[in-house]
């Protein structure tokens, strides 16, 4: 009996530009002889319903139809027909099919590959055209994919050390698509510093599918109006 097993859940998520390994494990009742078996990987894009060959391995020959695509002969011996794709791009997301032939048997499995890009975040202070004691703080998130993103603002005071979400005077602009397919967005917070306590910490909080934990950038309001300082930012998708 010949069986193929793909990633549990049927979906794999990978960061943009990563060297991704798309899993495909072979289960066979006898030891595998790689010289008498075949592996073919196919890809179907999200936009076109046409399947194309990515890689094939037959006995003493292998061929990559996508530059750098490879199945390890050394891993194949122990039943691992996973496909390595170096430098994965956004447009390579879609359905991947692993087809295994151990004559006369054939088995196959499919998996959805999602490619994500983590946002970079930075805080800017814009005082141009602002009234006295009024400041506009901008939180720029750039280079993310997919488009869906959530940006919120929080503040912590010495009286209330737990973060409180700010809903007033927040404007989040439209997402802008970059040439490489990633997106940018800016969220603005308008503050009247005369009405705020010195020592108040403000945070821009970015939540995105590519991030395990939100990306936080903060600044502290000082007696001298403001002190803009970006704390450690975590871009930790893995």
């Amino acid at each position: 009996d010949l069986k193929v097993e793909m990633m549990a859940g049927g979906t794999q998520i990978t960061p943009l530009n990563d060297n991704v390994t798309i899993f495909c494990n072979i289960f066979y009742s006898q030891p595998l002889n790689i010289t008498s078996m075949g592996i073919t990987w196919f890809w179907k894009s999200l936009t076109f319903d046409k399947e194309v060959k990515v890689f094939e391995f037959f006995g003493d020959h292998q061929e990559a139809f996508r530059p750098g695509a490879i199945v390890s002969p050394w891993r194949l011996k122990s039943g691992d027909a996973s496909l390595r794709l170096p430098g994965i791009q956004l447009e390579e997301a879609g359905e991947y099919r692993c087809e295994v032939v151990v004559t006369p048997l054939k088995a196959q499995g499919t998996v959805q590959l999602e490619v994500v890009a983590s946002p970079a975040s930075r805080l800017l202070l814009d005082q141009v055209g602002m009234k006295e004691n009024e400041d506009k703080y901008m939180c720029e998130s750039s280079g993310f994919y997919p488009e869906a993103i959530n940006i919120t603002w929080e503040k912590q005071t010495q009286k209330f050390p737990h973060p409180i979400e700010i809903s007033e005077d927040v404007i989040t602009g439209p997402t802008i698509k970059n040439m490489d397919g990633t997106f940018n967005v800016t969220s603005c917070l308008k503050l009247n510093s005369s009405q705020e306590d010195p020592g108040t910490v403000y945070q821009c909080v970015v939540r995105h599918a590519s991030l395990h934990t939100p990306l936080r950038s903060n600044f502290t309001l000082t007696a001298a109006r403001h002190s803009l300082s970006e704390t450690e930012k975590t871009d930790n998708f893995s």
Epitope: T21, N25, Q62, W74, R75, K77, S78, D80
Partner: antibody, heavy 120, light 111 residues
Framework: EVQLVQSGAEVKKPGASVKVSCKAS????????MDWVRQAPGQGLEWMGD????????LYNQKFRGRVTMTVDTSISTAYMELSRLRSDDTAVYYC?????????????WGQGTTVTVSS | DIVLTQSPDSLAVSLGERATINCKAS??????????MNWYQQKPGQPPKLLIY???TLHSGIPDRFSGSGSGTDFTLTISSLQAEDVAVYYC?????????FGQGTKLEIK
């Protein structure tokens, strides 16, 4: 920085088993296989087998089949090699080595070695 | 199993001179246009260190005085200008077939 840190020296009696560990750091553990190679005193190198951390699949040198068991714990990036029914000629330094498997096959980083002495 | 035979067993070369070690395989270690032959250096009390893989590719961080050549069954490791720190035992290894096998080693000394 890639590092493979092996467990300490062992002294065993004939017939016993030994389990050597190899803790990996500085790279994605599942992207490479782990080879196990041994070297008897004053002798050359002998490949014992390898394990694929991606699926736990193993390939053993026929010489050791039935006596060797290779396992991994991916949650702590650690590989293990257990050799049973030890004999005096199993006295050797046992090495784990990270093995590239996609673009050729070679052991590019090695552990410091674990000395196993089998003596009654 | 593929048997690898290194020659010579030991070699003494003067500092600055060329050192050549040969490795002969009992059958071809070529597959799909590549040669699966690797070379390692081992100094006393240390683990082996990768020098060359795929017959001729220099591993990162290895000085370019080391080079590898050959295909099929005959391979050569060359040190163009011997340095004192090159004193070691050198092993060839094939990775085309299991079990992966090593040569018996060549001990390189300074004359």
């Amino acid at each position: 920085e890639v590092q493979l840190v092996q467990s300490g020296a062992e002294v065993k009696k004939p017939g016993a088993s030994v389990k050597v560990s190899c803790k990996a750091s500085g790279y994605t553990f599942t992207d490479y296989n782990m080879d196990w190679v041994r070297q008897a005193p004053g002798q050359g190198l002998e490949w014992m087998g390898d394990i694929n951390p991606n699926n736990g699949g193993t390939l053993y040198n026929q010489k050791f089949r039935g006596r060797v068991t290779m396992t991994v714990d991916t949650s702590i990036s650690t590989a293990y090699m257990e050799l049973s029914r030890l004999r005096s000629d199993d006295t050797a330094v046992y090495y784990c080595a990270r093995s590239e498997v996609f673009y050729g096959n070679y052991a590019d980083y090695w552990g410091q070695g674990t000395t196993v002495t089998v003596s009654s | 199993d593929i048997v690898l035979t290194q020659s010579p067993d030991s070699l003494a070369v003067s500092l600055g001179e060329r050192a050549t070690i040969n490795c002969k395989a009992s059958q071809s270690v070529d597959y799909d246009g590549d040669s699966y032959m690797n070379w390692y250096q081992q100094k006393p009390g240390q683990p082996p260190k990768l020098l060359i893989y795929a017959a001729s590719t220099l591993h990162s961080g290895i000085p370019d005085r080391f080079s590898g050549s050959g295909s099929g069954t005959d391979f050569t490791l060359t040190i163009s200008s011997l340095q004192a720190e090159d004193v070691a035992v050198y092993y060839c290894q094939q990775s085309k077939e299991d079990p992966r096998t090593f040569g018996q080693g060549t001990k390189l000394e300074i004359k």
